[in-house]
Amino acid sequence: KFSKQSWGLENEALIVRCPRQGKPSYTVDWYYSQTNKSIPTQERNRVFASGQLLKFLPAAVADSGIYTCIVRSPTFNRTGYANVTIYKKQSDCNVPDYLMYSTVSGSEKNSKIYCPTIDLYNWTAPLEWFKNCQALQGSRYRAHKSFLVIDNVMTEDAGDYTCKFIHNENGANYSVTATRSFTVKDEQGFSLFPVIGAPAQNEIKEVEIGKNANLTCSACFGKGTQFLAAVLWQLNGTKITDFGEPRIQQEEGQNQSFSNGLACLDMVLRIADVKEEDLLLQYDCLALNLHGLRRHTVRLSRKNPIDHHS
C-alpha cells in the first residue's frame, strides 16, 4: 500500500514523492534500500532529497532500485517505499508499455489530456505535445496550463500522447517527457430495438431454377459500436448450420457498416443452383440485440424465363 512505482528516462529529470504523507513541518529521510545509505540533501548532488521529494537531476539507469522514505514526527515514524526504474532512451518512436502512464478517455464534450506527474516539477510554459511522436499542429490542439485540449474530438484522435517540458532547478534546465494513451468514447452512442432495412416483411423474391440466388438480411441497432447484436438467417425456423443443405450458406460481413450514423449489420444468404424444393421453404431474416428480436420473412417464387420466340 505504501509502495509506489516510478519510472523515467536516462538523462531526464525524475522527481519522486514519498508515498507516505505528512505535514510540511515533518522531516523526511530518504535511504537507498539496498545499501541503507542515506540520500544527501545537498542540491549539488545529482540525486538528492528535498523533504517529501527525491530528485534525480538527471536520472541514470544505475539509479534504478528501491528507495525508502521515513516521515518523522514528534510522535510517530511512517515508512514508505519508492520503486524507481530508469530506462534507456528508445531509438525508435515506439513508447513501450512500461513507460506509459494511465490511459485517459475523452469525448466530444470532454477532451482534456493531463500531463502526468507535472505537478511535481518546477516548469514553465510552453508545454509541448506529441501524438505518436509527431508534434501536434493545427488549431484543434490547445496546450493549456498542464493539459492538452482537443477540439471536435474524433475516433482518429485516439493514440499515445507525450508531453515534454523543462524542469528548472537552481538555474539548470532538465528535460522531462511523459506518455499516456488517449481513447475516444462516443458519448452519443446508444442501442435501440433492431430495425430491419432489408428484406421487406413478407417479401417475395423471384429466382431462376438452376441459377444462384442471394438474399441479404440487413438491420440497424443504434449509434456507435453495437456489442451483442446479431443478424442471421433461418430456414423453416432452423439455423442454417443445422438445416444440413450444403447448397445454402450464409456469409457475414466483417465489420459494422454505418448508415445515417447508425450501426448496421448484414448477412448474405447464398443459394447455389436453386431447386424447386427451395421455393417451398420459409426464409427468416432475424435481427436481435439486448432490446429484442425482429423477424422478416421472405419466400422465393419462380422467375419465368423471358420468352425470346417471335
Epitope: L228, A229, D242, E252, G253, Q256, L288, G292, L293
Partner: nanobody
C-alpha cells in the same frame, strides 16, 4: 438450462498476458453472439469485446484494440479472450455474456465473473 462459467483470471504483472475462457453448458444452438464485459471497483460495467457465434464478426472497445483478441470455438461452446500487454487499468472483474433467442424471444445470460488484477 444453459450456464456460463468463466475461468483464467488471476494476478499478472503489467505487460503480461492472460487468456480467459467462457464455457457454455447446456443447449447452445440458439446462441447469436457472445461478449466480454468488465467492471472495475466503483465504475460502471463496460464492454470489452464481442463475437458473432459464427465467428465472422468481432468488436472491440477502443481501450483494448490491438491488445485483446476474442475468439470462439463452437464445437466446445466456448468463447475466449486473449489479453496481451496488460495495463493496471485493465484490472476488473471480467464477465462473459451470451445473447441467444428462442422463437421471437431474446434472452441474455451472464457468468459469475473472473477477477483480473494487473499489478507489479
Amino acid at each position: 438450462e444453459v450456464q456460463l462459467v468463466e475461468s483464467g483470471g488471476g494476478l499478472v504483472q503489467p505487460g503480461g498476458s492472460l487468456r480467459l475462457s467462457c464455457a457454455a453448458s447446456g443447449r447452445t444452438d440458439s446462441t447469436a453472439s457472445m461478449g466480454w464485459f468488465r467492471q472495475a471497483p466503483g465504475k460502471e460495467r463496460e464492454e470489452v469485446a464481442a463475437i458473432s457465434w459464427s465467428g465472422g464478426r468481432t468488436y472491440y472497445a477502443d481501450s483494448v484494440k490491438g491488445r485483446f483478441t476474442i475468439s470462439a470455438d463452437n464445437s466446445k461452446n466456448t468463447a475466449y479472450l486473449q489479453m496481451n500487454s496488460l495495463k493496471p487499468e485493465d484490472t476488473a472483474v471480467y464477465y462473459c455474456a451470451r445473447l441467444a433467442f428462442q422463437g421471437n424471444t431474446v434472452f441474455d445470460l451472464w457468468g459469475q465473473g473472473t477477477l483480473v488484477t494487473v499489478s507489479s
